[in-house]
Amino acid sequence: AAPCPDACCPHGSSGLRCTRDGALDSLHHLPGAENLTELYIENQQHLQHLELRDLRGLGELRNLTIVKSGLRFVAPDAFHFTPRLSRLNLSFNALESLSWKTVQGLSLQELVLSGNPLHCSCALRWLQRWEEEGLGGVPEQKLQCHGQGPLAHMPNASCGVPTLKVQVPNASVDVGDDVLLRCQVEGRGLEQAGWILTELEQSATVMKSGGLPSLGLTLANVTSDLNRKNVTCWAENDVGRAEVSVQVNVSFPASVQLHTAVEMHHWCIPFSVDGQPAPSLRWLFNGSVLNETSFIFTEFLEPAANETVRHGCLRLNQPTHVNNGNYTLLAANPFGQASASIMAAFMDNPFEFNPEDPIPVSFSPVDTNSTSGDPVEKKDETPFGVSVAVG
């Protein structure tokens, strides 16, 4: 094949090599950029900056090599449009530093920085940590700081991410209240800070105030939906990013719902309870306190992380006619109490008719399915029961 006369020439099916001396001063308008997976650049003394716009449209890029060139600055967001980048070789350039933000969000298997006049400072603490932890092939490069010795020996005692303290109200917060949160930020070289409020949605009206080092946030007219929602304060400096999340507990009274008993391998009287603080629960059976045993007990479903409502079952293992009756769930917290009742009829007396027993309700036989937590059963009989849809 004839030699390629252009500044950049195809290499393989999805690669590009740019090695003609001094032909590039930016990476705009590279041919076939959208399909490139590999880009090799060498001997480009005029290529001094790598910025966000330079790599726009290189979404498939996996390997980027810029070596023996004049690169002095890589923008913190330079690789925003190349999320698949896994190998980055920037050796033998003029880089004095590289921000932690540059590689944040990438899954770099390899990062090569040897041959750069690195300047040891807290801004390279992240790279020192990669070296300590054996990440990205960094330890093998034995990186040196220009005139300062090995990167590994750089003092780092003062190189910390910002320290955050979020003050939340001590007093009980009620529905409709306004809540003031304050985030105190401490640390060296503070760059940016703010609030992440993505979970709040309609939980409150939000007003931000202040700036570094003290950020204010007013949550006005809060609703009970604010419970279990994260309010996050963040701050960044040249070392890294810190986040602290808090939750505001909004008090509201207990509430309870009961649903018709359903038969699985065992029986379940489904319930939902809500309230902040979480309500205490008590079951009554025909008006008397129900003592929970391995045959009848409260079983909670796994709670959703971002809501206060709890769902569960009063679980009954192989109930008989003596378990037919009125079930009441009482829920109480300091702000109120609630109750709900339901009649449940599991079966006729399977043993005999006894005049002293309550008169049972008759149901048609149904089949059942097995679920975990009970012996795996060999079936050769049809138990009594009732199949009910929960509406």
């Epitope: 929970e292 045993t293 391995s294 045959f295 009848i296 293992n317 192989q318 003596v322 937590g373 009970d374």
Partner: antibody, heavy 115, light 108 residues
């Protein structure tokens, strides 16, 4: 498959406290099951001691209630039995099992009460 | 009463049917479970609930109940069925469990 393994001293002095632990493997002690202790004196029948749920609910045999404590340690996936003021009549093989059906049992551990 | 009563010993000819019974007031209200125990071993659940058999238990084992009596029936007893059999159920209060005294089954 769920497995249970009892452990603890095989010899306890009269008036002392018997302490046993049951390690649960192959399943979580925080599942929808209760866990129970049963004992069997040499040459005699089975006696239910008590049961516990991971949320802390407990029930005890009325005849032993004043001397029995059953507790659960979710972090270690195990539950324990303490029986105080023991006498020779408490000499038995002690079993742990999964309630309510006792469908899984430990192999049992003999505890002798003797000075 | 919080008691379950079993016959101390029962025998059966090989291949024949045998019924082991368990009596108690709580059996009017609750199902019995049945356990097989061989010497030096932990008990094994054979029947629970309304004639339910755990996986691995042969179908010659079945359970039934009438009045204050629960029964374990072995249809076509085998030599390996020789063991002690215990019933249990909830006590009448429903708040604790009780065992029968056990029945020693001999297969002749």
């Amino acid at each position: 498959e769920v497995q249970l393994q009892e452990s603890g001293p095989g010899l306890v002095k009269p008036s002392g406290t018997l302490s046993l632990t049951c390690a649960v493997s192959g399943g979580s002690i925080s599942s929808s099951n209760w866990w129970t202790w049963v004992r069997q004196p040499p040459g005699k029948g089975l006696e239910w001691i008590g049961e516990i749920y991971h949320r802390g609910n407990r029930n005890y045999n009325p005849s032993l209630k004043s001397r029995v404590t059953i507790s659960v340690d979710k972090s270690k996936n195990q539950f324990s039995l303490k029986l105080s003021s023991v006498t020779a009549a408490d000499t038995a093989v002690y079993y742990c099992a999964r309630a309510p059906w006792f469908d899984y049992w430990g192999q049992g551990t003999l505890v002798t009460v003797s000075s | 009463s919080s008691e379950l009563t079993q016959d101390p010993a029962v025998s059966v000819a090989l291949g024949q049917t045998v019924r082991i019974t368990c009596q108690g007031g709580s059996l009017r209200s609750y199902y019995a479970s049945w356990y097989q125990q061989k010497p030096g071993q932990a008990p094994v659940l054979v029947i629970y609930g309304k004639n339910k058999r755990p996986s691995g238990i042969p179908d010659r084992f079945s359970g039934s109940s009438s009045g204050n009596t629960a029964s374990l029936t072995i249809t076509g007893a085998q030599a390996e069925d020789e063991a002690d059999y215990y019933c249990n159920s909830q006590a009448s209060s429903g708040n604790h469990l009780i065992f029968g005294g056990g029945t020693k089954l001999t297969v002749l």
